[in-house]
């Protein structure tokens, strides 16, 4: 879509408590999209998270990243994404990791695999039509 | 700016019933969260109910709250009301109308939520 990836610098980092708001509208003919807590701002850099809801399987893969190297998959209960649908992603970190929760209800607790304060970039993509990253 | 106008507050029997609205203007931005909550004389305001724009999403409820009370809102009209049935000694309090920047329940410790913008009150007294 025209208006990703979006890229939002964490200079400060982020802390237990932060609050990471996504809100967007999943394209009638999306495949998958992702949400990226990358280590740094340059190509390749950790992934601290990786959330990746895949319409085209009909699963929802959280992961992470380090040194270029993949970790092993989770996934999320069900898939509580909908093309055509719009929808509101929280990404809430804490001491052991991170929550997401999606719509009215928690959705998965992926734990930290990398600490938390080398985090320093959102990035959203994919087939994804944004509205809004906030962080709280 | 987002101005929010809160209305319908009043004095009411105990088993009564009122209903409140809150109407958002300004530069509120598509899609938002809109919510109530209450202070009592003496104590901390107080999460009552939050509704999303979208309506595939359900509405949050505060459990002193649950089944006498109901949520609703136009979004033609940037509005949001509560309905409220079965009022209590309890339910009095100033009544205040918010956008909600975001909401999530956290098991028994209630719902966590972050507030963008409050509106003023409207007092609602429920005594015989």
């Known amino acids: 879509m025209s208006n990703v990836p979006h890229k939002s610098s964490l200079p400060e980092g982020i802390r237990p408590g932060t609050v990471l708001r996504i809100r967007g509208l999943v394209p009638p003919n999306a495949s998958r999209f992702h949400v990226n807590l990358l280590c740094g701002e340059e190509q390749g850099s950790d992934a601290a998270l990786h959330f990746n809801p895949r319409l085209d399987t009909s699963e929802v893969v959280f992961n992470s990243k380090e040194q270029g190297s993949w970790g092993r998959e989770e996934r999320g209960p069900g898939v509580p994404f909908q093309r055509g649908q719009p929808f509101e992603v929280l990404i809430i970190a804490s001491d052991d990791g991170f929550k997401a929760v999606v719509g009215d209800a928690q959705y998965h607790h992926f734990r930290h695999r990398l600490p938390l304060a080398r985090v320093r970039l959102v990035e959203v993509g994919g087939d994804v039509q944004l509205d809004s990253v906030r962080i709280f | 700016e987002v101005q929010l106008q809160a209305s319908g507050g009043g004095f009411v029997q105990p088993g009564g019933s009122l209903r409140l609205s809150c109407a958002a203007s300004?530069?509120?931005?598509?899609?938002?969260?809109m919510g109530w909550f209450r202070q009592a004389p003496g104590k901390e305001r107080e999460f009552v109910s939050a509704i999303s724009y979208y309506s595939t999403r359900k509405p949050y409820y505060a459990d002193s709250v649950k089944g006498r009370f109901t949520i609703s809102r136009d979004n033609s009209k940037n509005t949001v009301y509560l309905q409220m049935n079965s009022l209590r000694a309890e339910d009095t309090a100033t009544y205040y109308c918010?956008?909600?920047?975001?909401?999530?329940?956290?098991?028994?410790?209630?719902?966590?939520?972050?507030?963008?913008?409050w509106g003023q009150g409207t007092q609602v007294t429920v005594s015989s």
């Open positions: 300004g530069s509120t931005s598509y899609g938002e969260t």
């Open positions: 918010a956008i909600v920047a975001y909401i999530y329940a956290d098991g028994v410790r209630g719902y966590h939520q972050k507030i963008d913008y």
